[in-house]
């Protein structure tokens, strides 16, 4: 289901992307789904839709709800919802579980923590990094772009660290702080060449046209904590996001796993109301990290439906 | 077959920056890995840093950290070398390589295709 | 930064000669390492691969052997094209490193 989860603190700025992408020419309109009443374009409005983003310049408490995101195209229109949660501020220093982004892992070798959200907002140097509330000082802290990374990495650097930065519109400034995890590993670990799980090579996959199909691209990269590993799909060589088809997407950011000690990742291509011409393309599930990239090519046939006639 | 065409020598003043590029033909960029290695006049290779275009980043080795710049235009097909705070000691061939097919892998890191190298030279 | 050494810096030999030349890496590096040859005024060619794998089109004469920390370039009959020098190179880690380099001299 194309749902997503977003959240966020009062009077702070919130941006909610469409989970349902396409290209830039088509037209996203946006509702609130309690009411279907639509939500406005015009940036007066402290709550406005621009384009796939869905803005909350501040953000209330009342503003939680389920929001629909209707992507319109000459030749069809895709649903998507964003069920966003708006939180009040903390009078404490603790941040809630439901408040935090993804637990990112570092080693000695690899210590970027990225800022959560980041992209989606209109923000200029500097980010603004605090661990368990404290600002952070000292040269061992460098924040680069929109990471922040620590040098010579120890165990009591684990917690969880904040990032703040300011969002401009139009002129006006609003804050915005994302939250995430930091976890250090041990660098006991190894890695292989890519290994893929899933798909076979030159797998053909039975889909049904009309329905909706899942490809899965797995892969294991070695033991512990990878420098660089990423499962991607590309469409007949060109990625995802290039190739144009707002039917067929990549789901955002990729699951991590760890299978037998190994350190995995997945990524799911989803294709919305499988067409003839999907049968045509080559679909190309890629791992990669430091030593290389192994390529396994899907295919997709046409499953017949079970004539239930006698 | 990847091929690598690198831009032409350079004569550079102390203190100044140098950029060299290396165009590649054959087979899909974004995919690649472009290494840039070193060969200063008598001595070994030594391993400046590297990008992988699909991933968007570089890494650099320590030594260079800082001074080297490593980027990569898939619209060209060109990745790009750029060293600042040139001194004599970085008077050295530059070449840029990238990785091999076999079967059905692309080894990243074991350079199998190499660029003819750019001379630049670091004179007062 | 994992240091790769080699061993002999340079050697002298003759045609029809076996050679060794011996590649060690500071920490483990599993199978992650390749073996290049240079000739003056050329870029390196890639001989070896993963520590043993022969690359396609390379002469049946070169081989190379050795996992862990410990890493072996053979050539079993010298020939007068292969007189150059000889670099092993892991992968293993970023930074890449580059052993020092094997110069092979005719006798």
């Known amino acids: 289901k194309f749902s997503k989860q977003s959240w966020g603190l009062e009077n702070e700025a919130l941006i909610v992307r469409c989970p349902r992408q396409g290209k830039p020419s088509y037209t996203v309109d946006w509702y609130y789904s309690q009411t279907n009443k639509s939500i406005p374009t015009q940036e007066r409005n402290r709550v406005f839709a621009s384009g796939q983003l869905l803005k909350f310049l501040p953000a209330a408490v009342a503003d939680s709800g389920i929001y629909t995101c209707i992507v319109r195209s000459p030749t069809f229109n895709r649903t998507g919802y964003a069920n966003v949660t708006i939180y009040k501020k903390q009078s404490d220093c603790n941040v809630p579980d439901y408040l935090m982004y993804s637990t990112v892992s570092g080693s000695e070798k690899n210590s970027k923590i990225y800022c959560p959200t980041i992209d989606l907002y209109n923000w200029t140097a500097p980010l603004e990094w605090f661990k368990n509330c404290q600002a952070l000082q000292g040269s061992r802290y460098r924040a680069h772009k929109s990471f922040l990374v620590i040098d010579n990495v120890m165990t009591e650097d684990a917690g969880d660290y904040t990032c703040k930065f300011i969002h401009n519109e139009n002129g006006a400034n609003y804050s915005v702080t994302a939250t995430r995890s930091f976890t250090v590993k041990d660098e006991q670990g190894f890695s292989l060449f890519p290994v893929i799980g899933a798909p076979a090579q030159n797998e053909i996959k039975e889909v049904e046209i009309g329905k909706n199909a899942n490809l899965t691209c797995s892969a294991c990269f070695g033991k512990g904590t990878q420098f660089l590993a990423a499962v991607l799909w590309q469409l007949n060589g060109t990625k995802i996001t290039d190739f144009g088809e707002p039917r067929i997407q990549q789901e955002e950011g990729q699951n991590q796993s760890f299978s037998n000690g190994l350190a995995c990742l997945d990524m799911v291509l989803r294709i919305a109301d499988v067409k003839e011409e999907d049968l045509l393309l080559q679909y190309d599930c890629l791992a990669l990290n430091l030593h290389g990239l192994r390529r396994h090519t899907v295919r997709l046939s046409r499953k017949n439906p079970i004539d239930h006639h006698s | 077959e990847v091929q690598l065409l690198e831009s032409g020598a350079e004569v550079k003043k102390p203190g100044s920056s140098v950029k060299v590029s290396c165009k590649a033909s054959?087979?899909?960029?974004?995919?690649?890995?472009i290494s840039w290695v070193r060969q200063a006049p008598g001595q070994g290779l030594e391993w400046m840093g590297g990008?992988?275009?699909?991933?968007?980043?570089?890494n650099y080795a320590q030594k260079f950290q800082g001074r080297v710049t490593i980027t990569a235009d898939e619209s060209t097909s060109t990745a790009y070398m750029e060293l600042s705070s040139l001194r004599s000691e970085d008077t050295a061939v530059y070449y840029c390589?990238?990785?091999?097919?076999?079967?059905?892998?692309?080894?990243?890191?074991?350079?199998?295709?190499w660029g003819k190298g750019t001379t630049v030279t670091v004179s007062s | 930064d994992i240091q790769m050494t080699q061993s002999p810096s340079s050697l002298s030999a003759s045609v029809g000669d076996r050679v060794t030349i011996t590649c060690r890496a500071s920490?483990?590096?599993?199978?992650?390492l390749a073996w290049y040859q240079q000739k003056p005024g050329k870029a390196p060619k890639l001989l070896i691969y993963?520590?043993?794998n022969l690359k396609t089109g390379v002469p049946s004469r070169f081989s190379g052997s050795g996992s862990g920390t410990d890493f072996t370039l053979t050539i079993s009959s010298l020939q007068p094209e292969d007189f150059a020098t000889y670099y092993c190179?892991?992968?293993?880690?970023?930074?890449?490193?580059f052993g020092g380099g094997t110069k092979v001299e005719i006798k």
């Open positions: 920490q483990s590096i599993s199978s992650w």
């Open positions: 190179q892991q992968t293993y880690a970023i930074p890449l490193t």
């Open positions: 054959g087979g899909t960029f974004s995919s690649y890995a």
């Open positions: 390589a990238s990785g091999f097919y076999s079967n059905d892998l692309y080894y990243y890191y074991y350079m199998d295709v």
């Open positions: 990008i992988i275009p699909i991933f968007g980043t570089a």
């Open positions: 993963d520590a043993s």
